[in-house]
Interface confidence: low
C-alpha cells in the first residue's frame, strides 16, 4: 500500500522567500504513479494545485499563476517536492501531497493523503531558539496509591511556530499510547502546549517517552523526553512519615539547564 | 463549476448514538461523479473513509456507511456508533476517475463538517483531584467527572500566570481536565474544584508515603543521599535544552 510522509510538519518563511516542501512516497514506486499537491487555506476548501505524473508530465490547476509553483519528483529518493516561489501572505496554508492507490480488488482506487505541511509566513525576528522547552511532571503519590494508575504530564513552552505534534511511547516500544492534550496556547510571541498520559499501575515501573515533533527541534529530529520509572510498592499510609510532607506529597522536579 | 456543500458546519454527536452527515452537489448531477469522504483529525491527518462503490479505508467498514441519494443530489455518511476517536472534520470530495470520457483524477472538496463528540448522558460522577508539581509549575489533574461543567482553582497567594484548563473526554466516556499555572509558592499550592454544586479539594486525596523513593533509579545511575533517607536519583531527559533533572521527594 502506498504511504505518504511529509517530513516537514511546518515551514516558516519570511515574505518573498522560496519554500520547498517534501513528500516521501513508500510502498509504491514513485516512477509508476502520479503525485498530487493540494492546498488548504484557512477557512477555504481544499484545492488541487498541481500534479506530476509517472512520466514527469506536470499539470497545473487553471487559475494558478504560472511560475508560482514548481513540482518535481526525484525517483532516486522516492520524493516529490513542491517549490513555492516568492511567498506572500496568500500562500499561508497547509499543503498536502496525495496519490491514487490501487486496492486489491481490480479497478478500485482510493486517494491517500500525506499528513500535510503548514506554510507559515512571519515578519517577526524571533529568538535564536524557538524549539519546544520541556518540563515534566510525574504522577502524584496520591493518584498512584488511590487509583492504581499514574499520570505523566509533558509541558512544552516557548516554541514557534504553533504547529507541534506530541505522542507517547513506552521506552522500548514503538506502539503509540493513547494520550490526551490541551489546546496550543499563545504566550507573548511564542506558544505552549501540554499532553498527558495515564498508565495503569503495572506500567508505572516502565520508562515512558514523550515524543515531540516541531520544525525548530535541534537537528530537525523528534525531541524525546524521558519519564523515569515509578516505584509504587513502597507507598504506605503511615501518617508519621515526614519525608515528603513539605512537598505536599508530590514529587518536586527541578530541571537544571546544563547545556553549553 | 460544481460545488459540494455540507449540510451543517458543526455536528455534535453522542458516544454510541448514530449520526448522519450530508453533503449536496450544486451545479451538476451527483451521479456523474464518484463521491469520497475523508476525516481530518488533530494534527491535520487526512484519512480516507469511503469511496463509491463500497470502498472503505482500513478500520472504517464496520462503523461507517456511505451512500448516494441521486434524487436529492446528495452524499450521505452515517457514523453507526460514534466514539471519541471519531471527532474531527469530515470532508466530502468528488472525482470522475475511471468513468471514461472526459475524466478528472483530481478531487474537488467541499468545506468540512466539524464533528464534536460528547459523552452519553449518564449519572453524575464526582471528580478525583490530584496536584503535580515541578519547580514553579503546578498542574491540577481532575479525573473522571460528569457532567462537563467545572471550575478549577489553583489556590495560591503568589500567582505568576495561569492557563485555561483543557477538558477532554476520558477513555471511559466521562471527562478529564488539567489546569496549569506558575506560582512563586508552588510548594503550598492546592487545587479546589467546583462541580455539580459541590467542592472537591486535592487535599482530600492526599496520602502519606514511607521514606523510600518513588522514582526507581537505573542500576547505572548515581544516587545522592540527602539528610533524610529519600533517594535523589538523576534522570536523563533526552532533549537539547534540558539534560539533567534532580528529583526531590
Amino acid at each position: 500500500a502506498g504511504h505518504l510522509e511529509q517530513p516537514q510538519i511546518s515551514s516558516t518563511k519570511t515574505l518573498s522567500k522560496t519554500a520547498r516542501l517534501e513528500c516521501v512516497v513508500s510502498g509504491i514506486t514513485i516512477s509508476a504513479t502520479s503525485v498530487y499537491w493540494y492546498r488548504e487555506r484557512p477557512g477555504e476548501v481544499i484545492q488541487f494545485l498541481v500534479s506530476i505524473s509517472y512520466d514527469g508530465t506536470v499539470r497545473k490547476e487553471s487559475g494558478i499563476p504560472s511560475g508560482k509553483f514548481e513540482v518535481d519528483r526525484i525517483p532516486e529518493t522516492s520524493t516529490s517536492t513542491l517549490t513555492i516561489h516568492n511567498v506572500e501572505k496568500q500562500d499561508i496554508a497547509t499543503y498536502y501531497c496525495a496519490l491514487w492507490e490501487a486496492q486489491q480488488e481490480l479497478g478500485k482506487k482510493i486517494k491517500v493523503f500525506g499528513p500535510g505541511t503548514k506554510l507559515i509566513i512571519t515578519d517577526k525576528q524571533l529568538d535564536a531558539d524557538v524549539s519546544p522547552k520541556p518540563t515534566i511532571f510525574l504522577p502524584s503519590i496520591a493518584e498512584t496509591k488511590l487509583q492504581k494508575a499514574g499520570t505523566y504530564l509533558c509541558l512544552l513552552e516557548k516554541f514557534f511556530p504553533d504547529v507541534i505534534k506530541i505522542h507517547w511511547q513506552e521506552k522500548k516500544s514503538n506502539t503509540i499510547l493513547g494520550s490526551q492534550e490541551g489546546n496550543t496556547m499563545k504566550t507573548n510571541d511564542t506558544y505552549m502546549k501540554f499532553s498527558w498520559l495515564t498508565v495503569p499501575e503495572k506500567s508505572l515501573d516502565k520508562e515512558h517517552r514523550c515524543i515531540v515533533r516541531h520544525e525548530n527541534n535541534k537537528n530537525g529530529v523528534d525531541q524525546e523526553i524521558i519519564f523515569p520509572p515509578i516505584k509504587t510498592d513502597v507507598i504506605t499510609m503511615d501518617p508519621k512519615d515526614n519525608c515528603s510532607k513539605d512537598a505536599n506529597d508530590t514529587l518536586l522536579l527541578q530541571l537544571t539547564n546544563t547545556s553549553a | 463549476a460544481i460545488e459540494l456543500v455540507p449540510e451543517h458546519q458543526t455536528v455534535p454527536v453522542s458516544i454510541g448514538v448514530p449520526a448522519t452527515l450530508r453533503c449536496s452537489m450544486k451545479g451538476e448531477a451527483i451521479g456523474n461523479y464518484y463521491i469520497n469522504w475523508y476525516r481530518k483529525t488533530q494534527g491535520n491527518t487526512m484519512t480516507f473513509i469511503y469511496r463509491e462503490k463500497d470502498i472503505y479505508g482500513p478500520g472504517f467498514k464496520d462503523n461507517f456507511q456511505g451512500d448516494i441519494d441521486i434524487a436529492k443530489n446528495l452524499a450521505v455518511l452515517k457514523i453507526l456508533a460514534p466514539s471519541e476517536r471519531d471527532e474531527g472534520s469530515y470532508y466530502c470530495a468528488c472525482d470522475t476517475l475511471g468513468m471514461g470520457g472526459e475524466y478528472t483524477d483530481k478531487l474537488i472538496f467541499g468545506k468540512g463538517t466539524r464533528v464534536t463528540v460528547e459523552p452519553r448522558s449518564q449519572p453524575h460522577t464526582k471528580p478525583s483531584v490530584f496536584v503535580m508539581k515541578n519547580g514553579t509549575n503546578v498542574a491540577c489533574l481532575v479525573k473522571e467527572f460528569y457532567p462537563k461543567d467545572i471550575r478549577i482553582n489553583l489556590v495560591s497567594s503568589k500567582k505568576i500566570t495561569e492557563f485555561d484548563p483543557a477538558i477532554v473526554i476520558s477513555p471511559s466516556g466521562k471527562y478529564n481536565a488539567v489546569k496549569l499555572g506558575k506560582y512563586e509558592d508552588s510548594n503550598s499550592v492546592t487545587c479546589s474544584v467546583q462541580h455539580d454544586n459541590k467542592t472537591v479539594h486535592s487535599t482530600d486525596f492526599e496520602v502519606k508515603t514511607d521514606s523510600t523513593d518513588h522514582v526507581k533509579p537505573k542500576e547505572t545511575e548515581n544516587t545522592k543521599q540527602p539528610s533524610k533517607s529519600c533517594h535523589k536519583p538523576k534522570a536523563i531527559v533526552h532533549t537539547e535544552k534540558v539534560n539533567m533533572m534532580s528529583l526531590t521527594v
Epitope: P7, S31, P75 | -
Partner: antibody, heavy 120, light 111 residues
Framework: QVQLQESGPGLVKPSETLSLTCTVS????????WSWIRQPPGKGLEWIGY???????NYNPSLKSRVTILVDTSKNHFSLKLSSVTAADTAVYYC??????????????WGQGTMVTVSS | QPVLTQSSSASGTPGQRVTISCSGS????????VNWYQQFPGTAPKLLIY???QRPSGVPDRFSGSKSGTSASLAISGLQSEDEAEYYC????????????FGGGTKLTVL
C-alpha cells in the same frame, strides 16, 4: 562538515548475522536518505539498501530477505543487519548519504568503509 | 553481475582525452540520472559527477559527463597521473522498485 563512520565486528561466522552501525557527525541525520553499499575484495560496488530518517526503507531485491536497516535519530546513527551470512558476504561495507535537491540521489558523502570477513 | 555495463579497463597518456562508457536500459539510465564515482585503492569512492553532467565543488573541470538514451559517458581531458583510479557509473532502476545499480567499474591507467 558531515562525516560518516562505520563500526562493527570485522569477523562474522557463517550463518550468523552481520551487524554494522554508521554514526553521522557534524550534521543531522534528519531529512536525508542513508545507504549501505558493499564491495567484495577486488570487485565492484553493490548497493544494499537505504533508509529515510523517519524509518522508510528500500532494499536491493537480491538481498531483501536478509537485510534490515534501522535508524536511531536520537543517537544520529543508522545500522545494517544482514542475516545468514556466507563467505560471499565478505566485503568492505560503506555507509553513504544520498544527496537531496540538486544532488538528486547521488551518494555525496561516504564513510571510509569497514572490512567484514565471513569465516569460521 | 552488474546491471550497468562498463569496459573493465581504459588507458591514456598524460594530456590525452579519455572516455569511459556506461550502458544500461530504459528502466535505469533511460529514465533516471547518472552519477559517476572515482575510487583510489584502499579508499572509499568519491562523487565525481552527478545528474549526468554536474560536478560537485572541488572536482576539476577536466571531468565531464554526458548521457544519451540508455548510455552515459565520462570524459577526462588533459589526463594526469593522479587520475589513475577505478571509475564507477551508477543510476537508479525503476523496474526494481528504485534500487541503486552500479556498473562493474573501469580501471583507468595513465601510461
Amino acid at each position: 562538515q558531515v562525516q560518516l563512520q562505520e563500526s562493527g565486528p570485522g569477523l562474522v561466522k557463517p550463518s550468523e548475522t552481520l551487524s554494522l552501525t554508521c554514526t553521522v557527525s557534524g550534521g543531522s541525520i534528519s531529512s536525508y536518505f542513508w545507504s549501505w553499499i558493499r564491495q567484495p575484495p577486488g570487485k565492484g560496488l553493490e548497493w544494499i539498501g537505504y533508509i529515510f530518517y523517519s524509518g522508510s526503507t528500500n532494499y536491493n531485491p537480491s538481498l531483501k530477505s536478509r537485510v534490515t536497516i534501522l535508524v536511531d535519530t536520537s543517537k544520529n546513527h543508522f545500522s545494517l543487519k544482514l542475516s545468514s551470512v556466507t563467505a560471499a558476504d565478505t566485503a568492505v561495507y560503506y555507509c553513504a548519504r544520498v544527496g537531496r535537491w540538486e544532488l538528486r540521489g547521488a551518494f555525496d558523502i561516504w564513510g571510509q568503509g569497514t572490512m567484514v570477513t565471513v569465516s569460521s | 553481475q552488474p546491471v550497468l555495463t562498463q569496459s573493465s579497463s581504459a588507458s591514456g597518456t598524460p594530456g590525452q582525452r579519455v572516455t569511459i562508457s556506461c550502458s544500461g536500459s530504459s528502466s535505469n539510465i533511460g529514465s533516471n540520472t547518472v552519477n559517476w564515482y572515482q575510487q583510489f585503492p584502499g579508499t572509499a569512492p568519491k562523487l565525481l559527477i552527478y545528474s549526468n553532467n554536474q560536478r560537485p565543488s572541488g572536482v576539476p573541470d577536466r571531468f565531464s559527463g554526458s548521457k544519451s538514451g540508455t548510455s552515459a559517458s565520462l570524459a577526462i581531458s588533459g589526463l594526469q597521473s593522479e587520475d589513475e583510479a577505478e571509475y564507477y557509473c551508477a543510476a537508479w532502476d525503476d523496474s526494481l522498485n528504485s534500487p541503486g545499480v552500479f556498473g562493474g567499474g573501469t580501471k583507468l591507467t595513465v601510461l
